[in-house]
């Protein structure tokens, strides 16, 4: 950056090089150039010469004042016009940053995805700070009182092998940057209560042309957890509202769920599961599309749902879905 240049003087910032966004700041430049009594001192921000709110303090020093500085990052340097020099002489440069102190981290959540071998902890960091902000995740055993700390920039994966202090822990998050430090509330966890079963996946759908046509959705999970509760939600792609069906599931075989749907309509399905009675659900599975036939029976398999597209749904947990090749309209 600009801070690596050889200086012929000094540049400094008040109140500091990293400061709260929206503050008034002063940047000072002091020349110390051999055989040069500067006629003029100039400031540049990101290579553009600044013209206004510059005050000459004395023969070697000038001040540039910014009101309500809102840029997250800027490279500043200053130059001098020396008598008998054709070009300006570089004095010094500095990178400056503005931002906010961190908010108190909240919504601290720790889960263990089955087979991952990790405990994944996440939190809501609050508003964007614009400056380098680090998080320390504290994990304290309630049985041994031993505490471990993990430094990260966002979420953290902690190997379950490293959690040797029994099953019960306190978890909290400390956020810190150059402008401040905040600490979350403590979350109490039991390792057995935070396991999320292996992802449930819808594999195919078929509509059986009975007296009243019915659609069967086939879905499965690789989980070894015995008691699993699941939800399947579905809707016509033109609708906003989801219908939800609940299931108590044993994944020793592929699940088959029956639905009585309107003919000649495209539907979208998703499934999610949790260990029965526990706290955390899986995220909803990928969107699965099935168009019910007018009269002819039809099978839709995951293998044929190859066109990736954005769902356009306003549900936060929906990921990119797949669409049957015969229907490419947006989801309403």
């Amino acid at each position: 950056g600009i801070t690596n240049i050889n200086c012929s003087g000094h540049i400094w910032v008040e109140p500091a090089t990293i400061f709260k966004m929206g503050m008034n700041i002063s940047i000072y430049c002091q020349a110390a150039i051999k055989n040069c009594q500067p006629r003029k001192l100039h400031f540049y921000k990101n290579g553009i010469k600044e013209r206004f709110q510059i005050t000459r303090i004395n023969k070697t020093t000038a001040r540039l004042w910014y009101k309500n500085f809102l840029e997250p990052h800027a490279s500043m340097y200053c130059t001098a016009e020396c008598p008998k020099h054709f070009q300006e002489t570089l004095i010094c440069g500095k990178d400056i940053s503005s931002g906010y102190p961190p908010d108190i981290p909240d919504e601290v959540t720790c889960v263990i995805y089955e087979y991952s071998g990790n405990m994944t902890c996440t939190w809501n960091a609050g508003k964007l700070t614009y400056i380098d902000t680090k998080y320390v995740v504290h994990v304290k055993s309630l049985e041994t009182e031993e505490e471990q700390q993990y430094l990260t920039s966002s979420y953290i994966n902690i190997s379950t092998d490293s959690l040797q202090g029994g099953k019960k822990y306190l978890v909290w998050v400390q956020a810190a940057n150059a402008l401040g430090m905040e600490e979350s509330k403590q979350l109490q966890i039991h390792l057995d209560d935070i396991v999320i079963p292996s992802a449930a996946v819808i594999s195919r759908a078929e509509t059986i042309n009975a007296t009243v046509p019915k659609t069967i959705i086939y879905w499965d999970s690789q989980t070894t957890i015995e008691k699993v509760s699941c939800e399947m939600r579905y809707k016509a792609t033109t609708n906003q509202t989801w219908n939800v069906k609940e299931f108590d599931t044993n994944f020793t075989y592929v699940q088959q769920s029956e639905f009585y749907l309107e003919p000649n309509i495209k539907y979208v399905f998703q499934v999610r599961c949790q260990e029965t009675g526990k706290r955390y659900w899986q995220p909803w599975s990928s969107l699965f599309f099935h168009k019910t036939p007018e009269t002819v029976p039809q099978v839709t398999s995951k293998a044929f749902q190859h066109d990736t597209w954005n769902s356009g749904l306003t549900v936060a947990s929906i990921s990119t879905g797949h669409l049957t090749s015969d229907n490419r309209g947006d989801i309403g």
């Epitope: 003029k40 100039h42 290579g47 553009i48 010469k49 013209r51 000459r56 000038a62 054709f86 300006e88």
Partner: antibody, heavy 117, light 107 residues
Framework: EVQLVESGGGLVQPGRSLKLSCVAS????????MTWIRQAPGKGLECVAS????????YYPDSVKGRFTISRDNAKSTLYLQMNSLRSEDTATYYC??????????WGQGVMVTVSS | DIQMTQSPASLSASLGETVTIECLAS??????LAWYQQKPGKSPQLLIY???SLNDGVPSRFSGSGSGTQYSLKINSLQSEDVSIYFC?????????FGGGTKLELK
């Protein structure tokens, strides 16, 4: 020796366009803010357009905003002023000048623009 | 925009006299004031910057002073070549603004 040489002035009818040029030499053009300043006959000085050293930002007073456009070609050390929809009140001598935090330290000789039918 | 009020609008003085021209800014401009001389039929020339710094090649009989909102240009021992219009200009705030000018004539 510092020189700023303007060209492109003349007599023009109201509503028509004119483009002024200013060729700079003797200083580091690409480090300099540049400005067009005009002076109506017997009147004071008015800045009509300024441009940053990189050309990334421009400034105009309300009297010319939307009609005048300042631009620069640093490779050619040349400053331009495109004047559209000219009015009789735009009649003036137009000076090209280098602008810095000490003021307008270099000026061209000026070029006369007369807007009249 | 910052208003620059120059006074007097015109003045007559004799050779060898000392002349003072005033400039008042509508806000504190922190000594970011320049003075220009415009001889008849010529371009303006920078005389003084930062309220009191003499530009290269300007005779020492010219001097500037002032701070805050009040500034002045003084010409000691007036010479015939000093007959000109003098303008003040602030360049602390955007846009830069000029005073209305002071026309200096010989008595």
């Amino acid at each position: 020796e510092v020189q700023l040489v303007e060209s492109g002035g003349g007599l023009v009818q109201p509503g028509r366009s004119l483009k002024l040029s200013c060729v700079a030499s003797g200083f580091t053009f690409n480090n300099s803010w540049m400005t067009w300043i005009r002076q109506a006959p017997g009147k004071g000085l008015e800045c009509v357009a300024s441009i940053t050293n990189t050309g990334g930002s421009t400034y105009y007073p309300d009297s010319v905003k939307g009609r005048f456009t300042i631009s620069r070609d640093n490779a050619k050390s040349t400053l331009y002023l495109q004047m559209n929809s000219l009015r009789s009140e735009d009649t003036a001598t137009y000076y090209c000048s280098r602008e810095d935090n000490s003021g307008y330290d270099y000026w061209g000789q000026g070029v006369m623009v007369t807007v009249s039918s | 925009d910052i208003q620059m009020t120059q006074s007097p609008a015109s003045l007559s003085a004799s050779l060898g006299e000392t002349v003072t021209i005033e400039c008042l800014a509508s806000e504190d401009i922190y000594s970011n004031l320049a003075w220009y001389q415009q001889k008849p039929g010529k371009s303006p020339q920078l005389l003084i910057y930062y309220a009191n710094s003499l530009n290269d090649g300007v005779p020492s009989r010219f001097s500037g002073s002032g701070s805050g909102t009040q500034y002045s240009l003084k010409i000691n021992s007036l010479q015939s070549e000093d007959v000109s219009i003098y303008f003040c200009q602030q360049n602390y705030y955007s846009p830069p603004t000029f005073g209305g000018g002071t026309k200096l004539e010989l008595k």
